[in-house]
């Protein structure tokens, strides 16, 4: 059984308020900022986590070349609107009535506009490329050991089904992890690749979202794998719509 039952805490989300007021006196946890009840046996959605973060007090080459439609999250933090299931609403607006459309991981995929901007649907991010540079080690990691350890990490820590880890590429010191998940592949209860990628990003930055003080401890054959840079590319099922002036 989990500490959530003993101490009434949320193992998968430290940005929650928990109390034993669920059915039968069971521990129930709600996300900060939104008050939405979360399932502490799995990852909390990125939208609810960003909302909680904004409400908290301020403090032969094997490598993949991302295509021209790949998005990088350059806009930084914002206080998002989430739907009742915790997903990002397709249209996001700030306090000054500037609006834009986002994909399923909350990254802007159109130019910014005003309140008349329409975002017809939430476009799914189906391919995520996590690009890492690891700190110097005595020698290169063995590729198959690294591959196995990262797949196990995503399965055990982030509860992501192994079929969604498409590939692990390695060219010292660069590691690339490819996550793929089409709308048709994602079954009820499956962790979303966007949520797994966000938890991983926070982990490698030393900002773990999991309860407890320990943080991520990742080793390959006993050798610590420490990340010094992370870049994440997001590819959507429908390419983004930006005007040409953005490219100049």
């Amino acid at each position: 059984h989990t500490a959530a039952q003993d101490n009434c805490t949320c193992p998968t989300n430290k940005m929650t308020v928990c109390s034993p007021d669920g059915p039968g006196g069971r521990c129930q946890c709600r996300a900060l900022g939104s008050g939405v009840a979360v399932d502490c046996s799995t990852l909390t959605s990125k939208c609810l986590l960003l909302k909680a973060r904004m409400s908290a007090p301020k403090n032969a080459r094997t490598l993949v070349r991302p295509n021209e439609h790949a998005l990088v999250d350059n806009d930084g933090l914002y206080d998002p609107d989430c739907d009742p299931e915790g997903r990002f609403k397709a249209r996001q607006c700030n306090q000054t009535s500037v609006c834009w459309c986002v994909n399923s991981v909350g990254v802007r995929r159109t130019d910014k506009g005003d309140l008349s901007l329409r975002c017809d649907e939430l476009v799914r991010t189906h391919h995520i490329l996590i690009d890492l540079r690891h700190r110097p080690t005595a020698g290169a990691f063995n590729h198959s050991d690294l591959d196995a350890e990262l797949r196990r990490l995503f399965r055990e820590r982030y509860r992501l089904h192994p079929k969604f880890v498409a590939a692990v590429h390695y060219e010292q010191p660069t590691i690339q992890i490819e996550l793929r998940q089409n709308t048709s592949q994602k079954a009820a209860g499956d962790v979303d690749i966007g949520d797994a990628a966000y938890y991983f990003e926070r982990d490698v930055k030393g900002e773990s979202l999991f309860q407890g003080r320990g943080g991520l401890d990742l080793r390959v054959r006993g050798e610590p794998l420490q990340v010094e840079r992370t870049l994440i590319y997001y590819l959507d099922e429908i390419p983004p719509k930006f005007s040409m002036k953005r490219l100049t």
Partner: nanobody, 126 residues
């Protein structure tokens, strides 16, 4: 689903030995912080010993030199070898695991551990 199941508890005379075991399922024990805690009647749960994913171990001052924590990666089990037992070691002993791929920090805190076994009773008589 992660499950921890302790065994090996029992009654022993002071100065005797016991070996506790914890069978781990649904989790690779070698990838995360694992430990033993104990709780005597009317007292707080206290950390006894932990083992990190690196294999490095730490024991509480009260059991140093007497208790040894170890892990069998092939069998996915955690053990606690207890020697020179004292009456004050009498308690319910719990096996605990942190969320997968989590590190161990000192001082030991039960709040850092997600998964718990049901416990096994150790009674030491003088």
């Amino acid at each position: 689903q992660v499950q921890l199941q302790e065994s090996g508890g029992g009654s022993v005379q002071a100065g005797g030995s016991l070996r506790l075991s914890c069978a781990v399922s649904g989790l690779t024990s070698s990838t995360t912080c694992m430990g033993w805690f104990r709780q005597a009647p009317g007292k707080e749960r206290e950390g006894v010993a932990v083992i990190r994913s690196s294999g490095e171990t730490t024991a509480a001052d009260s059991v140093k030199g007497r208790f040894t924590i170890s892990r069998d990666n092939a069998k996915n089990t955690l053990s606690l070898q207890m020697t020179s037992l004292k009456p004050e070691d009498t308690a319910m002993y719990y096996c605990a695991a942190a969320w997968p791929y989590s590190g161990c920090l000192l001082p030991l805190s039960s709040g850092d551990f997600t998964y718990w076994g049901q416990g096994t009773q150790v009674t030491v008589s003088s």
